[in-house]
């Protein structure tokens, strides 16, 4: 039975041209994390494999940096970066946990972080 919970940074906003950290955290399970995939609307951004390390998709090499931890840093944000991001935790023996983050990239200088929330 899958008992874990993914906690994410939730709905967040950031300024155009700035950067943002996407963070997920898996809790309430003793399952081993074998890999974390980061996706933007079905497109692979990055992989963090427990044995082999990070892979940043060639399409995003110039604007995505690994970390901190299992998180992902998006740089040089544009309004086109607005949308859903998913952290997909592959674990053993539980299986797959998915967390969702919605990022809004704002033209204005006012960008506030939303509240944290959980996806079971």
């Amino acid at each position: 039975m899958m008992t874990g919970t993914i906690e994410t940074t939730g709905n967040i906003s950031a300024e155009k041209g700035g950067s943002i950290i996407l963070q997920c955290h898996l809790s309430s399970t003793t399952a081993q994390v074998t890999q974390v995939n980061w996706e933007q609307q079905d497109q692979l951004l990055a992989i963090c494999n427990a044995d082999l390390g990070w892979h940043i998709s060639p399409s995003f090499k110039d604007r995505v940096a690994p970390g901190p931890g299992l998180g992902l840093t998006l740089q040089s944000l544009t309004v086109n970066d607005t949308g859903e991001y998913f952290c997909i935790y592959h674990t053993y023996p539980d299986g797959t946990y998915t967390g969702r983050i919605f990022l809004e990239v704002l033209e204005s200088s006012v960008a506030e972080h939303g509240a944290r929330f959980q996806i079971p």
């Epitope: 992989i47 892979h55 060639p58």
Partner: antibody
Framework: EVQLVQSGAEVKKPGSSVKVSCKAS????????IGWVRQAPGQGLEWIGD????????NYNEKFKDRVTITADKSTSTAYMEFSSLRSEDTAVYYC???????????????WGQGTLVTVSS | DIVMTQSPDSLAVSLGERATINCKSS????????????LAWYQQKPGQPPKLLIY???TRESGVPDRFSGSGSGTDFTLTISSLQAEDVAVYYC?????????FGGGTKVEIK
């Protein structure tokens, strides 16, 4: 020992499709990319696309995007490349490759299948 | 797309002599985060699939003789065979794996003079 074993040679008519398989062994299939590269007779190497089985993420060369579908079956550690609307100029040896594109190892296409000759002729 | 240009197209070298193959990319292959150039070299003998020789510009694949070496950075790269052996007769390809689509040079045929 890492091995990539491809299906046998094919002869196809123009306009038809071909599906080539690539069975991987000797490593964790989900952890590495499987790519497809072709080589026309006497010519150089051309990258078609790849798949990451640990998420089924695919990337295609725009030149082939409308005619190629790459899939993977994790249960059998087998990747497939289906090429449609074949033309005579698609006659080539098609290779599958294992790709290591991690930022800490980055060994590129470190293992290659033996190749599958696809001949397109009327 | 990144264009990979190899030179020369063919090369005839005496046994025991040095062979040098050049490869130029239309864009830099240097990834600033890990300071690695995403450039590989392959050897292909007649009737065989290509074989990885060198990755990240200069790292020899396991089992590759040390007479093969790679150098360069950014857009200009070189494969050197320090002392050509009969078994080195082959076609050599450079390849970038920095960005999609991955692309190869046109190949350099190395023969014995």
């Amino acid at each position: 020992e890492v091995q990539l074993v491809q299906s046998g040679a094919e002869v196809k008519k123009p306009g038809s499709s071909v599906k080539v398989s690539c069975k991987a062994s000797g490593y964790t299939f989900s952890n590495y990319w499987i790519g497809w590269v072709r080589q026309a007779p006497g010519q150089g190497l051309e990258w078609i696309g790849d798949i990451y089985p640990g998420g089924a993420y695919t990337n295609y060369n725009e030149k082939f995007k409308d005619r190629v579908t790459i899939t993977a079956d994790k249960s059998t550690s087998t990747a497939y490349m289906e090429f449609s609307s074949l033309r005579s100029e698609d006659t080539a040896v098609y290779y599958c490759t294992r790709g290591d594109y991690y930022d800490s190892s980055g060994r590129a296409m470190d293992y290659w299948g033996q190749g599958t000759l696809v001949t397109v002729s009327s | 797309d990144i264009v990979m240009t190899q030179s020369p197209d063919s090369l005839a070298v005496s046994l025991g002599e040095r062979a040098t193959i050049n490869c130029k990319s239309s864009q830099s292959l240097l990834y600033s985060r890990n300071q690695m150039n995403y450039l590989a070299w392959y050897q292909q003998k007649p009737g065989q699939p290509p074989k990885l020789l060198i990755y990240w510009t200069s790292t020899r694949e396991s089992g590759v003789p040390d007479r093969f070496s790679g150098s360069g950075s950014g857009t200009d790269f070189t494969l050197t065979i320090s002392s050509l052996q009969a078994e080195d007769v082959a076609v050599y390809y450079c390849q970038q794996y920095y960005s999609y689509p991955y692309t190869f040079g046109g190949g350099t045929k190395v023969e014995i003079k």
